[in-house]
């Protein structure tokens, strides 16, 4: 069969090979398409099918406006004046080029190091569906690679049968990367030999959050080992401005205290032994934990354990500076 590609809504003429150019003609057109259940033989006299396909005086078949339901096989069997039979066989496929794709809900700013929605690419009115793809600085973006994720949706219009495609792009920009990346989206038609359609590019700014300097936890006495009844002071040092809120944890459990950068443990008893750390919470960066320090009791004559070893735990008597 000869492959024919026709644009939806456009006319199409299929020639009946071997047919005399004028009546009388011995020919028969039949079709098997989305409008038929099996083969439909068209009456040369015309009829209700004429709005879809009708036989012209020269024997050709005329489709005034090709539709999705006209995809299928068209066959003509003709006999010339000498009684020689010729068959024509066409496989018709239809297409519709959508409007230029657009990027909607586009971000003007992205944050490095975290996932960001870049925008949603929309293409309306294609057939067959086709595909959307994203580009960064002119190069194709591969979903599920290097912090790139794409959420796609395809809808079909209930009356026209044409497709609407949507593609939402999420990226995690690398720290220290291009501060003004260029994103674009393109629609590739489902039928071959048709050019891709491109959106206008968007160029969001990449914002680099200033990395928080490490949260320092200072313990006095050094090493965190103290005689029974002694005092331990824990100080949480955060260079960030404005000062973040400081909370305290013991053995992984938050302590029910008001936020404070200093924690004093007076008159140490066995119940105060354990692993302590502070948590600095900055509005734009989220929580940051310090290293853990171990507080332990040493009996007279013992050497203090090194910082970081774990002692016992229990409800202690806590005081805030």
């Amino acid at each position: 069969a000869q492959n024919i590609t026709a644009r939806i809504g456009e006319p199409l003429v299929l020639k009946c090979k071997g047919a005399p150019k004028k009546p009388p003609q011995q020919l028969e057109w039949k079709l098997n398409t989305g409008r038929t259940e099996a083969w439909k033989v068209l009456s040369p006299q015309g009829g209700p099918w004429d709005s879809v396909a009708r036989v012209l005086p020269n024997g050709s078949l005329f489709l005034p406006a090709v539709g999705i339901q006209d995809e299928g096989i068209f066959r003509c069997q003709a006999m010339n004046r000498n009684g020689k039979e010729t068959k024509s066989n066409y496989r018709v496929r239809v297409y519709q080029i959508p409007g230029k794709p657009e990027i909607i809900d586009s971000a003007s700013e992205l944050t490095a190091g975290v996932p960001n929605k870049v925008g949603t690419c929309v293409s309306e009115g294609s057939y067959p569906a086709g595909t959307l793809s994203w580009h960064l600085d002119g190069k194709p973006l591969v979903p599920n690679e290097k912090g790139v994720s794409v959420k796609e949706e395809t809808r079909r219009h209930p009356e026209t049968g044409l497709f609407t495609l949507q593609s939402e792009l999420m990226v995690t920009p690398a720290r220290g990367g291009n501060p003004h990346p260029t994103f674009s989206c393109s629609f590739s038609p489902g039928l071959p030999r048709r050019r891709a359609l491109h959106t206008a590019p968007i160029q969001p700014r990449v914002w680099e959050p200033v990395p928080l300097e490490e949260v320092q936890l200072v313990v006095e006495p050094e090493g965190g080992a103290v005689a029974p009844g002694g005092t331990v002071t824990l100080t949480c040092e955060v260079p960030a401005q404005p000062s973040p809120q400081i909370h305290w944890m013991k053995d992984g459990v938050p302590l029910p205290l008001s936020p404070s950068p200093v924690l004093i443990l007076p008159e140490i008893g066995p119940q105060d032994q354990g692993t302590y750390r502070c948590v600095a919470t900055h509005p734009s960066h989220g929580p940051q934990e310090s290293r853990a320090v171990s507080i332990s009791i040493i009996e007279p004559g013992e050497e203090g354990p090194t910082a970081g070893s774990v002692g016992g735990s229990g409800p202690g008597t806590l005081a805030l500076a």
Partner: antibody, heavy 119, light 107 residues
């Protein structure tokens, strides 16, 4: 709202002529084939004539061919049926309907107009 | 020409009954069969299009089906407002042909 309103019916003698009109509203007239269908008293429905949307192709059953002519004026959104050489068997209620091709099978009908052929 | 043989010509039924009217096409007309309802003194109204599709505004108790060349209109749980004449139509070939009609009455 789609409306089809027929007019021009009446009593006519055999052999004479009559012209029916159908004014439509509520849809884009030149997008649709149009058809006349008749119903004889106490009898079934019978297809009379169809015309394609541009008006350049017309279709008739043998019973009215060469006597009846269907036409349309897309600018006026009006369908016509010119009936010549009328016979008593043409006595019927004539309906103007939207459609006539395989894409639209008579989804809207006018109220009908009575034509009586009698001497 | 295609013949559309419609049966029965009339039926007398009770409210709440399920009824089926059939039309047999003398040759293949594919899906191109419509069903119309006509109440006394009124214009026909399309009920089913392309053999099986319910037209807009038609109650769901009406349905259309097809088995080969036999096309059926079924009304389940008949209501008093369904009393009417019913006509089938083939619109696949000229001349377009209607069935002879079925009169549905209440016992």
């Amino acid at each position: 709202e789609v409306q089809l309103v027929e007019s021009g019916g009446g009593l006519v003698q055999p052999g004479r002529s009559l012209k029916l009109s159908c004014v439509v509203s509520g849809f884009t007239f030149n997008n649709y084939w149009m058809t006349w269908i008749r119903q004889t008293p106490g009898k079934g429905l019978e297809w009379v004539a169809s015309i394609n949307n541009s008006g350049d192709n017309t279709y008739y059953p043998d019973s009215v061919k060469d006597r009846f002519t269907i036409s349309r004026d897309n600018a006026k959104s009006t369908l016509y049926l010119q009936m010549n050489s009328l016979r008593s068997e043409d006595t019927a209620t004539y309906y103007c309907t939207r459609g006539g091709d395989i894409t639209t099978g008579f989804d809207y009908w006018g109220q009908g107009v009575m034509v009586t052929v009698s001497s | 020409d295609i013949q559309m043989t419609q049966s029965p010509s009339s039926m007398s039924v009770s409210l709440g009954d399920t009824i089926t009217i059939t039309c047999r096409a003398s040759q293949d007309v594919g899906i191109y069969v419509n069903w119309f309802q006509q109440k006394p003194g009124k214009s026909p109204r399309r009920m089913i299009y392309r053999a099986t599709n319910l037209a807009d505004g038609v109650p769901s108790r009406f349905s259309g089906s097809r088995s080969g060349s036999i096309y059926s209109l079924t009304i389940s749980s008949l209501e008093s407002e369904d009393v009417a004449d019913y006509h089938c139509l083939e619109f696949d070939e000229h001349p377009l042909t209607f069935g002879s009609g079925t009169k549905v009455e209440i016992k």
